[in-house]
Interface confidence: low
């Protein structure tokens, strides 16, 4: 399996990964919204998807990965696996992954998944904008 880098990737590599992730994320979110109409966003789920200690903000892969591993059995496994593969490339070796529990209640679970997908898409937009506004 892919070994996480021990150093920060160059911006050009990060940009390629973000470009790979954006359509995957958007497609997953749109498919889920079509399939699960009327499911509200959960205000108790917070994806800490950006690092607060770097400028421009960096995608916090170690914080995001556990959520996608958690929702993998409950969503489109093929797309989720592609997202995990890309996020793995961004993950630093020394960064621990936290454990994530999916709500047991079906409705809460759907709301949880929707929120993760929405927040992840928003994060990708934010990182992509900051990468494009910085030096190429």
């Amino acid at each position: 399996s892919h070994m996480a880098p021990t150093h920060q990737l160059p911006p050009s590599d990060v940009r390629k990964i973000i470009l790979e992730l954006q359509p995957l994320s958007r497609g997953l979110l749109e498919d889920y919204q079509k399939k699960e109409t009327g499911v509200p966003e959960s205000n108790r789920t917070l994806l800490l998807c950006l690092t607060s200690d770097s400028q421009p903000p960096r995608l916090n892969s170690s914080a995001i990965l556990p959520y996608f591993r958690a929702i993998r059995p409950l969503s489109d496994k093929n797309i989720i696996d592609k997202i995990i593969e890309q996020l793995d490339k961004l993950k630093f070796q020394h960064e621990p992954e936290t454990e994530i529990s999916v709500p047991a209640d079906t409705f809460e679970c759907k709301s949880f998944i929707l929120t993760i997908l929405q927040q992840f898409s928003a994060c990708l937009e934010s990182v992509f904008k900051s990468l494009n506004s910085g030096p190429q």
């Epitope: 917070l46 800490l48 621990p96 454990e99 047991a104 927040q119 928003a122």
Partner: antibody, heavy 118, light 111 residues
């Protein structure tokens, strides 16, 4: 109904040890992070320790790190706080608290009193 | 660590009056547009109870007269119309980063 019942509080001499327990019921214990928060007599609240739902991750403030250890036994629905090298300033009511999400403490037990005095 | 400065330390108001308590953090406690600030009520001889989580979300079962707002470093907690059962100490708490820290509390009394 969510219930958190603490026990193990006692009078102990400075330098002594104590183990607090918290038995949880009314929810799936293994799905939730848990914390200990304390309150010295007549004072405010102070966060003591947090443990992730599976027990892999633990967090402490600097003044407690190395002296206290938070742990859990999901099979027994029980949270623990092992307290070593106790000081007079550790005298407080210790509350067991359930976590929701990664950051919110939503249910509190009634507390167990720890008194450190010679 | 993030220091939480809560004010006022105590408050004595009449029934049905509006109550406002503020909490100022020494640095931003917001993340991705969400204020990681929570408010608790502690009645005499009881354990604290969560009222508001993540700045403005009302905890289930909590009366709608309680509300919260704010972002960044400045947050406020409001009781729209004070009731006798609201006599308690109120605490703010941040969970933006470890160590989690609380405000020193506001003691609320009825005149």
């Amino acid at each position: 109904e969510v219930q958190l019942v603490e026990s193990g509080g006692d009078l102990v001499k400075p330098g002594g040890s104590l183990r607090l327990s918290c038995v949880a019921s009314g929810f799936t214990f293994s799905n939730y992070g848990m914390s200990w928060v304390r309150q010295a007599p007549g004072k405010g609240l102070q966060w003591v320790a947090t443990i992730s739902y599976g027990g892999s991750y633990t967090y402490y403030p600097d003044n407690i790190k190395g002296r206290f250890t938070i742990s859990r036994d999901n099979a027994k629905n029980t949270l623990y706080l092992q307290m070593n090298s106790l000081r007079a300033e550790d005298t407080a009511m210790y509350y067991c608290v359930r976590g929701y999400g990664y950051d919110t403490m939503d249910y509190w037990g009634q507390g167990t009193l720890v008194t450190v005095s010679s | 660590e993030i220091v939480m400065t809560q004010s006022p330390a105590s408050l004595s108001l009449s029934q049905e009056e509006k109550v406002t308590i503020t909490c100022k953090a020494s640095q931003s406690v917001s993340f991705a547009g969400t204020g990681l600030m929570h408010w608790y009520q502690q009645k005499p001889g009881q354990a604290p109870k969560l009222l508001i989580y993540r700045a403005s979300n009302l905890e289930a079962g909590v009366p709608s007269r309680f509300s919260g707002s704010g972002s960044g470093t400045d947050f406020s907690f409001t009781i729209s119309s004070l009731e006798p059962e609201d006599v308690a100490v109120y605490y703010c708490q941040q969970s933006r980063e470890y160590p989690w820290t609380f405000g020193q509390g506001t003691k609320l009394e009825i005149k």
